[in-house]
């Protein structure tokens, strides 16, 4: 599940990791674009082992994964993509 949120909250991530997470371990991904109280883009990953991690948006593996998910979401493949706009 890929989610893009636009929020007015401050930054959520207090530390970021570049460590690769295999897709089979990922339950959900949330993207928080920069702005509205946080000067940087944030990517939050929920893992299937009930842990949660902020991923460095510059990490190559997450950029590749985002691109794959975007492509799938614009095709007919059944990969749910949620884009929620929160005022």
């Amino acid at each position: 599940v890929l989610e893009v949120y636009y929020t007015s909250l401050r930054c959520r991530c207090v530390q970021e990791s570049s460590v690769f997470i295999p897709r089979r371990f990922i339950d959900r991904i949330q993207i928080l674009p920069r702005g509205n109280g946080c000067p940087r883009k944030e990517i939050i990953v929920w893992k299937k082992n009930k842990s949660i991690v902020c991923v460095d948006p510059q990490a190559e593996w997450i950029q590749r994964m985002m691109e794959v998910l975007r492509k799938r979401s614009s095709s007919t493949l059944p990969v749910p993509v949620f884009k929620r706009k929160i005022p």
Epitope: E42, K50, S51
Partner: antibody
């Protein structure tokens, strides 16, 4: 406002099964990311994590007690449960339930119940 | 399992003193550490999360730091209301493990 409250038998005998209930409000265990954990504290000693249960019924146990622990939930009644079989005097402690929410920043056990004192005595 | 070695087990300090409590992790926990305060007869409450971040409503005299595998809670100027037990918790991996606790008393 998040609140949790534990209930249990108070006193029980060795070899019996301890059944604890955590009744909570202000959140739902059907919401993505929500969990409830159990922690105990013998009088005058430190805290020991026992088990967690999550919104999707995923369960985690302390391996030192795993074969004696069962955690479960009743989502519709906002309750979580812990059973400990074959109790011994070493299980005498105050038992707490606490909420965890998988959000960033992640602070496990951000809200706690008041605790329930359990004594195992013959 | 990750072991959390907390020291001291108890200490006595005077009002205004600088107080430091330490937990040492047996494996890398990458800042996945919380400090809880537990006042007598009460439930624990989180004070510091992710090793260095102050929880809501916690006075600024409290701070957290890390040096390698050692994680510390410091009270810059002790006040009477700080008399309590303090516990560290690692949540890097299951099973979650607590330190043995530190009882902080006022001289």
């Amino acid at each position: 406002q998040v609140t949790l409250k534990e209930s249990g038998p108070g006193i029980l005998q060795p070899s019996q099964t301890l059944s604890l209930t955590c009744t909570f409000s202000g959140f739902s265990l059907s919401t993505y990311g929500m969990g409830v954990g159990w922690i105990r504290q013998p009088s005058g000693k430190g805290l020991e994590w026992l088990a967690n249960i999550w919104w999707d019924d995923d369960k985690y146990y302390n391996p030192s007690l795993q074969n004696r622990l069962t955690i479960s939930k009743d989502t519709s009644n906002n309750q979580a449960f812990l059973k400990i079989t074959n109790v011994d005097t070493a299980d005498t402690a105050t038992y707490y339930c606490a909420r965890s929410e998988l959000i960033m920043p992640y602070v496990p056990f951000d809200y706690w119940g008041q605790g329930v004192r359990v004594t195992v005595s013959s | 399992d990750i072991q959390m070695t907390q020291s001291p087990s108890s200490m006595s300090a005077s009002l205004g003193d600088r107080v430091t409590i330490t937990c040492q992790a047996s494996q890398d926990i990458d800042n996945h550490l919380i400090w809880f305060q537990q006042k007598p007869g009460k439930s624990p409450r989180p004070m510091i999360y992710y090793a260095t971040n102050l929880a809501n409503g916690v006075p600024s005299r409290f701070s957290g730091s890390r040096s390698g595998s050692d994680y510390s809670l410091t009270i810059s100027s002790l006040e009477s209301e700080d008399m309590a037990d303090y516990h560290c918790l690692q949540f890097k991996q299951y099973p979650f493990t607590f330190g043995s606790g530190t009882k902080l008393e006022i001289k």
